[in-house]
């Protein structure tokens, strides 16, 4: 039975040209995480495999950095980065958990970040 829950940064915004941390946290379960996939719509951004480490998709290598933890840092943001992002946690024995984050990249110099996780 799947007892865990995924906490995410929720809806966040950031400035064009800046960077943002996408973060998910799996709680309320003792399930072992085997791999986390980060996807934007249907496009793979990166994976973190518990045994084999991080792998960043080639088209994002220049502006996606692994971490912190199982999170993902997006750099050099453009307005095209606006949209939904998903963290997909593969675990056993529970199965798959999915979290959703909506990122809005703003042209203006004032962009409010989500309250759950923040970039210093």
């Amino acid at each position: 039975m799947m007892t865990g829950t995924i906490e995410t940064t929720g809806n966040i915004s950031a400035e064009k040209g800046g960077s943002i941390i996408l973060q998910c946290h799996l709680s309320s379960t003792t399930a072992q995480v085997t791999q986390v996939n980060w996807e934007q719509q249907d496009q793979l951004l990166a994976i973190c495999n518990a045994d084999l480490g991080w792998h960043i998709s080639p088209s994002f290598k220049d502006r996606v950095a692994p971490g912190p933890g199982l999170g993902l840092t997006l750099q050099s943001l453009t307005v095209n980065d606006t949209g939904e992002y998903f963290c997909i946690y593969h675990t056993y024995p529970d199965g798959t958990y999915t979290g959703r984050i909506f990122l809005e990249v703003l042209e203006s110099s004032v962009a409010e970040h989500g309250a759950r996780f923040q970039i210093p």
């Epitope: 994976i47 495999n49 998709s57 056993y92």
Partner: antibody
Amino acid sequence: QVQLQQSGPELVKPGASVKISCKASGYGFSGYWMNWVKQGPGKGLEWIGRIFPGDGDTDYNGKLKDKATLTAYKSSSTAYLQLSSLTSEDSAVYFCARWLGGFTSWGQGTLVTVSA
Amino acid sequence: QIVLSQSPAILSASPGEKVTMTCRASASVSYMHWYQQKPGSSPKPWIYATSNLASGVPARFSGSGSGTSYSLTISRVEAEDAATYYCQQWSSDPPTFGAGTKLELK
């Protein structure tokens, strides 16, 4: 559900090459390591290598590095194992297997027989 | 590479009997995976990360161990358990398998 469908049996001559396929369905092919495992007749299991279909990154068992070449095509969700300069020692069943904290999904296996 | 030694090579048991098979590693590993294989079929994931039963595996199976010594135990053997069981590690490259323990029923 996750399925790995492998190509059919092959009978090949010594010195020749063979290319076998593994078509994946039921998951996002590009985001998971695909592995190949060899099982000789009446023998145990031996890891050949792995490929990350998202960018073609590969890693091989040093023992079989000159024997095997792994490729993958995202467009068709298919991974390939090519074996070269075949000898009787290469006669075996070859499995593709997805790694997710264990070899969680396996193809049905492809029998390769090397015989003159 | 890490060598995994399984014992016994062949295990003969009667239905209802408790059996244990072991897997020893030539160096310490974080955890061990186990697979069941029947003739003419591909291996099936059986136990993940030392002690987690794969989906559909009966509760009579259990796994334990740490460091260089791991084991798979069947509390009461049934006819359908007749198969070869392989241990496997990927704590260091390359991943390796044991030679297998063949469980036969009397």
